[in-house]
Interface confidence: low
């Protein structure tokens, strides 16, 4: 069986001071001893805890230790459970408070001949007694004008008079100990017929339009007199305003209205008051018009990272004084940490790229708020994502050196060909990201290249050789199209390089050798007597070990070439009449022809009337006119050449026959008649 | 010390696989190119491969596709992974730093055997 | 690629002689040229940098010269120490290739 050797008792306690509740179990086996308080288990705390199996109190608290504990032994294998006597604390205690205004209820109630009544908020167990003091004089019951109630803690005044007036303050005493108030109270009676002052007054500031209000209050026995006078010294009442007052209304518990405030009513209101007896009491209070200004714009800023910086807002002019504050994502900056508000000013330390943005001052005031948006920019140095490489790029095709860095803000890429700055050009194109392209690499390009890329922060860069690979060309490349004269001699070239010489070698494009009297001599293609059968597609190809070979199609044609078989002649005509330019070519292909009169060819589907050209080439021109007059240009061409030839032609007045003449004596030269 | 250190040679049979290692100290390690260079005991000098700052790599023709260059920065570490190993590539394989267009600075080497 | 060719592949010769080793490259590498000194069991030590420039540290008894293929390295006055296997290499384009290297013996 459990058996308690020791249990807890009741005992008197101190508010704050140790205390301990024993209790001491003997059992056959092993117990496990917990508390109730209440019937509520209770729980160890650094003030409350079991000590061995009594229950230790570090400081007795009057509110959490009030109730009934109990030792509760359990033997945790039989289940058998036993419980101690129940013991509490009488706790003492002693807690200091104001003295405060119980009767009436509030100080502006507190007049002559009133019964005023005091509490003194001192509070313990036992209760304690009470004592009170004026002015630090002890008071003892039973004096005149007032009565103590130590049950209720109160001093009474009946009738309060001015004699009243002073600091009253209280001390208790108990069994526990002795304390004072903690906050003591002004009782102030004066003489009723001097005014006094109750409501004053306060400086306002107001946005236009709006409404502005002054309170002002006196109190005298009897009732004193108030008047509003405006700067001039002119009194406002509600049957005499000043013109600039109009919208002014006194209300009859003093206060002023003032509504649609506008500039010309701010300035020094004074509310007088005099009493039946005693000086005139005179108040003063100033009307502001709020007003803020625009804020000045901020610059962009670019800042270095780990540098510290700062950015001042200066505040604009405002009544009242504007508040200012910083914004970063729409979050306001704290007055500490690394990114914080100082005064007006925005300070960034150890600055880290994180730290851009756009950050704001805002400015507030009654008359609006005003907001300016600076933008940080945090510049690092550039880093490499690619640095240019030495190259080897191929003539005539496009060439890239990459220089790819990244920082902020972007960075300024400038690349130098030998040390000398490359202005964008034709050939030259510098992309966004910083690589260089060469549109059309050239074998003088292979050279030095080096690239800079630049912030505020700093600057890096890196160089890479060029080595310009030639490539296997043509030089020139043969015309496509080329014409042999029908039984004459003839060559058609073919060259080209490569960075090995290349070998060069003709053949038909059909695949099939030339014939005997057709020779290949180093890329020279020789036709000892073109024959009709020469005519054709042919292939010359050039080749080399390194690149491979390239071809260059060419389509022979053989022809006769052209040969006038009639010429135009040197013709004069009559005004009016007809003349006939007659022109006749030959060869193969059949030659077409063409007329150009006076430097410009003349178009068979826009002759007009007058011209026409004949299937055979020759050109008629009817009625001809002075201005018909000049060069005409015959011009004969098939698709392996051209040749041209011309002749004048006048046109004169016809001249008015003479007797002596005959019909038959001809013209000084040939004419042509119609 | 600005050193280069070597390590993961060894022997290994033909087609087989090993990965050298290049451990950098003493020096801004990220701000160099860096190459392996081999030598065939007793015989001359040949370079392997080579990377960039950037990671831009380089590689022979007798090598390439089947050797793999790479960097680790933060490790300060060089590597050259070797696949399909012939016995043509038996050698002390150095790893080297390469500025200004010459090799500055040179480890001590690590011996490579590929035999059956 | 660019072959480098050595000459000699081997030389004998006696401390205080004047040696000159010869590099010829198969293309035109302008002054892209380095050699290296390679003493046994040793690891090749840079001794001359862009045809002529000397590397910090390396006696002035060594010195080089040429520029396009055609280079030579000269020991003024061989001392003990020089006995070594000596390389060139070209840098001018990747791949980056050695000579055959050249063994300079005690006589």
């Known amino acids: 069986a459990i058996v308690f050797i020791k249990q807890p008792s009741s005992q008197d306690a101190l508010q704050g001071r140790r205390a301990l509740l024993r209790c001491e179990v003997e059992a056959p086996g092993p117990v496990h001893v917990y508390w109730l308080l209440d019937g509520a288990p209770v729980q160890d705390t650094e003030r409350r805890f079991a000590q061995g199996s009594s229950l230790s109190f570090a400081a007795v608290d009057r509110l959490q230790d009030s109730g009934t504990f109990q030792c509760v032994a359990r033997d945790d294998v039989t289940g058998e459970e036993a419980r101690s006597a129940n013991a509490s604390f009488n706790i003492k205690w002693i807690e200091a408070g104001p003295v405060v205004l119980k009767h009436p209820a509030s100080e502006a109630e507190i007049q002559p001949q009133t019964q005023v009544t005091l509490r003194c908020h001192i509070d313990g167990h036992p209760r304690p007694t009470y004592q009170w003091f004026r002015d630090g004089t002890p008071l003892s019951d039973g004096q005149s004008n007032h009565t103590v109630s130590s049950k209720e803690r109160n001093l009474t005044l009946r009738p309060a008079g001015p004699e009243h007036s002073g600091l009253y303050s209280c001390c208790a005493h108990s069994a526990f100990g002795q304390a004072c108030s903690s906050q003591n109270f002004t009782l102030s009676i004066a003489d009723e017929s001097f005014a006094r002052v109750v409501l004053a007054p306060q400086d306002v500031v107001v946005a236009r339009y709006e409404e502005a209000m002054f309170h002002c209050q006196f109190s005298a026995q009897p009732p004193p007199s108030l008047q509003w006078l405006f700067e001039d010294e002119t009194p406002i009442t509600n049957r005499s305003r000043p013109p600039h007052l109009r919208r002014a209304t006194v209300f009859a518990n003093g206060s002023l209205l003032l509504t649609q405030v506008r500039p010309r009513n701010a300035g020094i209101y004074r509310c007088i008051g005099q009493g039946q007896r005693g000086p005139p009491i005179i108040l003063e209070a100033t009307l502001h018009l709020a007003e803020i200004e625009d804020m000045p714009l901020f610059e962009p800023r670019v800042f270095t990272a780990g540098s510290e910086e700062r950015v001042t807002c200066l505040p604009p002019k405002g009544l009242p004084e504007p508040s200012v504050w910083w914004e970063h994502a729409g979050v306001r900056l704290p007055t500490h940490g690394r990114v914080y508000q100082k005064g007006h000013e925005l300070v960034l330390a150890n600055i880290a790229e994180s730290d851009a943005g756009v950050y704001t001052c805002h400015a507030a005031n009654l008359a609006g708020q005003r907001r300016q948006d600076v933008n940080i920019t945090v510049a690092t140095v550039p880093s490499w994502l690619k640095k240019p490489q030495d190259s080897q790029l191929e003539e005539g095709k496009p060439g890239y050196l990459d220089c790819l860095t990244q920082a902020t803000p972007k960075p300024t890429v400038v690349w130098y060909r030998n040390q000398m700055l490359i202005s964008e050009d034709s050939r030259f194109e510098v992309f966004k990201n910083g690589t260089l392209r060469i549109n059309s690499v050239e074998v003088y390009d292979g050279t030095w290249y080096r690239c800079m890329s630049s912030t505020p922060a700093g600057s890096i860069e890196a160089q890479a050789r060029v080595q310009v690979l030639e490539k296997l060309k043509f030089t020139p490349p043969p015309q496509p199209q080329q014409c042999m004269e029908f039984d004459k001699e003839a060559t058609v070239p073919c060259s080209a390089t490569g960075r090995e010489k290349p070998t060069i070698k003709w053949e038909r494009a059909d695949g099939s050798s030339l014939p005997e009297w057709v020779t290949d001599n180093a890329g020279t293609l020789h036709f000892a007597r073109v024959t009709r059968d020469d005519a054709g597609n042919y292939t010359c190809i050039a080749s080399n070990g390194p690149q491979g070979q390239i071809r260059a199609h060419v389509q022979l044609t053989v022809a006769v070439f052209i040969t006038f078989k009639v010429e135009p002649e040197r013709t004069t005509v009559y005004q009016g009449h007809t003349a006939l330019l007659q022109c006749e070519a030959q060869g193969d292909p059949k030659p077409l022809i063409q007329w150009k009169g006076k430097d410009r060819i003349l178009d068979p589907t826009k002759l007009g009337p007058r011209m026409h050209i004949f299937q055979n080439g020759s050109l008629v021109i009817h009625d001809v006119a002075p201005e018909d007059s000049g060069r005409y240009t015959c011009i004969a061409g098939n698709s392996c050449n051209i040749k041209h030839t011309e002749a004048p032609l006048y046109v004169v007045d016809k001249p008015v026959p003479e007797e002596s003449e005959g019909p038959g004596s001809p013209p000084p030269y040939k004419m042509i008649q119609t | 010390e600005v050193q280069l250190v070597e390590s993961g040679g060894g022997l290994v049979q033909p087609g087989g696989s090993l990965r050298l290692s290049c451990a950098a100290s003493?020096?801004?390690?990220?701000?160099?190119?860096m190459h392996w260079v081999r030598q065939p005991t007793g015989k001359g000098l040949e370079w392997v491969s080579s990377?960039?700052?950037?990671?831009?790599?380089n590689y022979p023709g007798s090598v390439k596709g089947r050797f793999t260059i790479s960097r680790e920065n933060a490790k300060n570490s060089l590597y050259l992974q070797m696949n399909s190993l012939r016995a043509g590539d038996t050698a002390v394989y150095y790893c080297?730093?390469?500025?200004?267009?010459?090799?500055?600075?040179w480890g001590r080497g690590t011996l490579v055997t590929v035999s059956s | 690629d660019i072959q480098m060719t050595q000459s000699p592949s081997s030389l004998s010769a006696s401390v205080g002689d004047r040696v000159t080793i010869t590099c010829r490259a198969s293309q035109s590498i302008s002054n892209f040229l380095n050699w290296y000194q390679q003493r046994p069991g040793k690891v090749p030590k840079l001794l001359i940098n862009a045809a002529s420039s000397l590397q910090s540290g390396v006696p002035s008894r060594f010195s080089g010269r040429g520029s396009g293929t055609d280079f030579t390295l000269t020991i003024g006055s061989l001392q003990p120490e020089d006995f070594a296997t000596y390389y060139c290499?070209?840098?001018?384009?990747?791949?980056?290739?050695f000579g055959g290297g050249t063994k300079v013996e005690i006589k």
């Open positions: 990377i960039g700052t950037a990671g831009n790599t």
């Open positions: 080297a730093r390469w500025v200004n267009w010459y090799f500055g600075l």
């Open positions: 003493g020096f801004t390690f990220s701000s160099y190119d």
């Open positions: 290499q070209q840098s001018y384009i990747t791949p980056l290739t």
